[in-house]
C-alpha cells in the first residue's frame, strides 16, 4: 500500500482543516488508514482523524481544531496499521479556504433597487471576520449568456444594484463566495443560490 498523491490540506481558519490524498489502488480509507495530526506546541498531543473515501483510491479527512492562529504548525502522519506511509507538516494560515457565506437574501421591495444581503461566515472574534471580500454571481435561468459577477471589495456583506440592469419579467439566481487577501486565500465555495423574479416599472418614454 502506497500513497500516490501526497495529502494536501486547506483550513477554514476556524475549526476544520480538510486533507485529501490518493492511494495507489482502491482503498477502504476508514478501515485501513489513520491520519494523526499534532500541533507543534508545548504539551500538545496527537489527535486521530479517520478518513472517508473520496472516489476509489481517494481519501479525505476532516481535522478538528480547537483554535487557529497565524503561527500554528501541525505535523501529519499517515498510517496504515503499524506502517508509516507518509509524514509531513501543515501550516493552516498558509492554506486558507474561507467558509462559504450564508443566508443570501434578495430584497426586492426597495424602489427599483435590488438589495442582496448575506451573512459573514465567521464570528466577530475570528481574524477573518474583518478581512473578507466577496464576489456575487447573478445569472438568468432563461438565458445562459446573461451571467455576471459583481466584486464586493468593501467589508459590508451586501450589494445594491439597479433592477433595470437586469431584464424585467424573468427569473434570476444569485450566489456569493468569499476570499481574504490578507492570507492570500483561495475562494470559498459558492453559497447556496437564491431565486427571485425580476420585475420593475419601465421608465415612461416620451416621444
Amino acid at each position: 500500500m502506497k500513497v500516490l498523491q501526497e495529502p494536501t490540506c486547506v483550513s477554514d481558519y476556524m475549526s476544520i482543516s480538510t486533507c485529501e490524498w490518493k492511494m495507489n489502488g482502491p482503498t477502504n480509507c476508514s478501515t485501513e488508514l489513520r491520519l494523526l495530526y499534532q500541533l507543534v506546541f508545548l504539551l500538545s498531543e496527537a489527535h486521530t482523524c479517520i478518513p472517508e473515501n473520496n472516489g476509489g483510491a481517494g481519501c479525505v479527512c476532516h481535522l478538528l481544531m480547537d483554535d487557529v492562529v497565524s503561527a500554528d504548525n501541525y505535523t501529519l502522519d499517515l498510517w496504515a496499521g503499524q506502517q508509516l506511509l507518509w509524514k509531513g507538516s501543515f501550516k493552516p494560515s498558509e492554506h486558507v479556504k474561507p467558509r462559504a457565506p450564508g443566508n443570501l437574501t434578495v430584497h426586492t421591495n426597495v424602489s427599483d433597487t435590488l438589495l442582496l444581503t448575506w451573512s459573514n461566515p465567521y464570528p466577530p472574534d475570528n481574524y477573518l471576520y474583518n478581512h473578507l471580500t466577496y464576489a456575487v454571481n447573478i445569472w438568468s435561468e432563461n438565458d445562459p449568456a446573461d451571467f455576471r459577477i459583481y466584486n464586493v471589495t468593501y467589508l459590508e456583506p451586501s450589494l445594491r444594484i439597479a433592477a433595470s440592469t437586469l431584464k424585467s419579467g424573468i427569473s434570476y439566481r444569485a450566489r456569493v463566495r468569499a476570499w481574504a487577501q490578507c492570507y492570500n486565500t483561495t475562494w470559498s465555495e459558492w453559497s447556496p443560490s437564491t431565486k427571485w423574479h425580476n420585475s420593475y416599472r419601465e421608465p415612461f418614454e416620451q416621444h
Epitope: L42, L43, S44, E45, D67
Partner: antibody, heavy 118, light 107 residues
Framework: EVQLVESGGGLVQPGRSLRLSCEAS????????MHWVRQAPGKGLEWVSG????????GYADSVKGRFTISRDNAKNSLYLEMNSLRPEDTALYYC???????????WGQGTLVTVSS | DIQMTQSPSSVSASVGDRVTITCRAS??????LAWYQQSPGKAPKLLIN???RLQSGVPSRFSGSGSGTDFTLTINSLQPEDFVTYYC?????????FGQGTRLATK
Amino acid sequence: EVQLVESGGGLVQPGRSLRLSCEASGFTFDDYAMHWVRQAPGKGLEWVSGLSRTSVSIGYADSVKGRFTISRDNAKNSLYLEMNSLRPEDTALYYCAKWGTRGYFDYWGQGTLVTVSS
Amino acid sequence: DIQMTQSPSSVSASVGDRVTITCRASQDISIWLAWYQQSPGKAPKLLINVASRLQSGVPSRFSGSGSGTDFTLTINSLQPEDFVTYYCQQANSFPITFGQGTRLATK
C-alpha cells in the same frame, strides 16, 4: 462555569513532603493540559509544572525538577502536585491553572498556601 | 531559559490616562505571549492571549501587540479598577516564564 479548587497546603518543615490537589469542574477536564504556578509572598508569578491531557508530556521548572511530581486523574477531574524535599524557598501560594491550548492560562484557582519553615 | 523583562516596573497615572507596558523576550517567541492582571489577594486574570487577542469578557480598552521579542500592553482610558499589577508570560518553550510584573499606581 469553570472552577478550579486547590487544597492540601499548610505548614511543613524543611525536607518534608506535601501533596496538593486541584479539583476541576465546568469544562471537559481531559481535553486540556493543566499546570501549577506559584507566587511567593510579595513576589511575582513562577511557573512550576504542567502536563498534557493524557500525561504523555510533562514539564518542570529547574527549581523543582527531581523534587516535585505532577500528575492527574482524568476520571476524578483532578490535578496533583507531589512535593518532596521541601525548602523554605518553596513557600508560596500555589495556583492550579487551565491551559488554553495556545500558551496561556485562561482559568486559575484561588490558590493554596504552602509554608515551609522549621 | 527565556527571560521576560517588563518595563517599567511601576508606573503612575490618572483615571482616563493611556498607559503602555512593554515586555521584552531574551529570544524570539513568535506570538506566544499572554498578559495578565492581578489584584491584591486575587488570582491572576487573563487579558490578552497570543500577543494580541483580547480574552473574552475583557474590556476593549485593553489591547496587545507585538511579535518576536518586543510586545506591548496598552490600556486606554484608565479606570479605577485598573490600578493593579500586570504580568507578561511566554509559552514558546519550557520553562514557561513570566515577567517580573508592572505595578500601576495612581498619581
